[in-house]
């Protein structure tokens, strides 16, 4: 057979569906490696063939499209799952061809097993928002196509796994979920049941969102550094141990990029000739408020090193702060003795 | 085809019991299996069910103190925890052949074996 | 959480006569229910499924209707070999059950 550009598999798509339930996918060709549409391809006389590699298989082998109640189907670029069995779990590759022209693509999916209560080894999407801020809305996601809008599904949500009914800010509106004035409490998983016929048969897709209540924009500050401040000396004797943290305090912003580091006399650490290592840790409040904590230190410090300028830095989307630390020579008391 | 159930006795309060569902001529990887029970003059209460694919679903008081599993000839139910209120037939079904709803249809049922709880 | 009302709990009617049983579901499950039938100290036994198509071996003077929310079992020209219990059980969903099945109608033939 000709050459075919092969794009290899396509991790970044790790298509995880759940066992038991419809799933509709896109031939990612048309999505994210070719420059024109399904449609287009069609009435250039491409055609569109898929197959499959068991897992833990190494043959390449086509999809059956004569299972019973047409399990398996193909439907322009999209591949239907009526419903997904457990042992569906496979790299799939969709093949765009004809006598001179060739592309493929493979992409791995996971039919993953839920119990009662939505539990599973699915990744969710997490939705942030804002504490005690306005009204939040969250629809129930991945749904489109599934049925045509002549269908009027049921909706059913749950945290956790108790159905919501008359939750005090919190209200289901057919695929939306809203939140009123959300609070801290309103974390954890909420998942939507879409219950839809078709031809006589009764479907079921279960989507989960991750809901994250963080700190308002409202609240919003520059970077607040704790330490090192002006109320503590670091004073040490040459060949000590000197170890001086920075510590700050970055409230949540959506999507901020929040920084800290150190400068030794105007240069970064890597810049100077110290022996000084930097060890950074973080920790989240519930709103997840972050606080970054950079401890520099140098094992044997010497008299030079106790006369260099130690500055603190920090900087989010608000803004920049720095802070030196008060780095002093320890004098010792000269020593008399009485003959 | 046929369904059986094995393993029921009488037990005192706390004791786990575990009962088994034996299959005869049914592949499992093709059936959904229910466990079903019911108390003396009572009515019929689901206890949960294992589809073809393995996964578990249980009714909400069932959750936690029961617990399904199979093989491939065989459906257990494991019960922790048994109360006098646990006291009942506990029945195997099979589902309806189908890839969707009709597994919860209970076209074939065992005969049910008996759990008394008592001190 | 999902319910099933099943009404009424027990009736009785002459040979030759005509029941009704009626079952309700707490949200739709469109045509996703099953009856029952049980006789004393024996198994439970598929009568109808899909609301109202007849399991194999079953009478055609069993019929069931309905979907939605509202279900109907009617046993025209009851015998009295129909003198058992009869159940309706919803297949549509297993989330958030207490119990998919009804609570059980008891018909007794004169």
């Known amino acids: 057979s000709e050459r075919c550009d092969d794009w290899g598999l396509d991790t970044m798509r790790q298509i995880q569906v759940f066992e038991d339930e419809p799933a509709r996918i896109k031939c990612p060709l048309f999505e994210h490696f070719l420059k024109y549409n399904y449609s287009t391809a069609h009435s250039s006389g491409l055609t569109l063939i898929w197959y499959w590699t068991r897992q833990d298989r190494d043959l390449e082998e086509p999809i059956n499209f004569r299972l019973p109640e047409n399990r398996i189907s193909k439907e322009k670029d999209v591949l239907w799952f009526r419903p997904t069995l457990l042992n569906d779990t496979g790299n799939y590759t969709c093949m765009l061809r004809n006598t001179t022209y060739c592309s493929k693509v493979a992409f791995p999916l996971e039919v993953v097993q839920k119990d009662s209560c939505f539990n599973s080894a699915m990744r969710f999407p997490v939705h942030k928002m804002y504490i005690e801020h306005g009204i939040h809305k969250i629809t129930c996601p991945n749904v489109d196509g599934y049925f045509p809008s002549s269908v009027k599904p049921s909706v059913t949500w749950y945290k956790g796994c108790t159905e919501i009914v008359d939750f005090h800010n919190v209200l289901p509106e057919g695929m939306n979920l809203s939140f009123f004035i959300p609070l801290v409490s309103n974390n954890g998983n909420y998942t939507c049941v879409v219950t839809y016929p078709e031809n006589g048969r009764l479907f079921h897709l279960t989507r989960t969102v991750t809901v994250k209540v963080v700190g308002s924009p409202k609240d919003a500050l520059p970077p607040q550094i704790y330490s090192p401040n002006d109320r503590v000396v670091y004073e040490k004797e040459p060949g000590e141990e000197l170890v001086i943290p920075c510590k700050v305090y970055f409230s949540f912003i959506m999507d901020s990029h929040n920084e800290v580091w150190w400068t030794i006399d105007g240069k970064k650490p890597d810049d100077v000739t110290v022996d000084i290592t930097i060890n950074e840790s973080v920790s989240y409040s519930s709103t997840e408020d972050e606080t970054r904590t950079q401890i520099l230190s140098i094992k044997k410090v010497t008299p030079e090193d106790l006369r260099r300028n130690y500055v603190c830095h920090a900087r989010n989307t608000k803004g920049e702060a720095e802070q030196a630390a008060k780095v002093k020579q320890k004098v010792i008391p000269p020593r008399y003795t009485v003959e | 085809q046929s369904v059986e159930e094995s393993g029921g006795r009488l037990v005192t309060p706390g004791t786990p019991l575990t009962l088994t569902c034996t299959v005869s001529?049914?592949?499992?990887?093709?059936?959904?299996m229910s466990w079903v029970r019911q108390a003396p003059g009572k009515g019929l209460e689901w206890i949960g069910s294992?589809?073809?694919?393995?996964s578990t679903y249980y009714a909400t008081w069932a959750r936690g103190r029961f617990t399904i599993s199979k093989s491939s000839t065989t459906v257990d139910l494991k019960m922790t925890s048994l109360t006098t209120e646990d006291t009942a037939t506990y029945f195997c079904?099979?589902?309806?052949?189908?890839?969707?709803?009709?597994?919860?249809?209970?076209?074939?049922w065992g005969p049910g074996t008996l759990v008394t709880v008592s001190s | 959480a999902f319910e099933m009302t099943q009404t009424p709990s027990s009736v009785s009617e002459p040979v030759g006569g005509t029941v009704t049983i009626k079952c309700q579901a707490s949200q739709s499950i469109y045509n996703y229910l099953s009856w029952y039938q049980q006789k004393p100290g024996q198994r439970p036994k598929l009568l109808i499924y899909?609301?109202?198509t007849l399991a194999s071996g079953v009478p055609s003077r069993f019929k069931g209707s309905g979907s939605g929310t509202e279900f109907t079992l009617t046993i025209s020209g009851v015998e009295s070999a129909d003198a058992a219990t009869y159940y309706c059980q919803q297949g549509a969903t297993s989330y958030d059950i207490e119990n998919p099945f009804g609570g059980g109608t008891e018909v007794v033939v004169k």
């Open positions: 079904a099979r589902g309806c052949p189908g890839y969707n709803g009709d597994k919860y249809t209970f076209d074939l």
């Open positions: 294992v589809i073809s694919g393995g």
């Open positions: 001529g049914i592949d499992l990887s093709n059936y959904a």
């Open positions: 899909r609301a109202s």
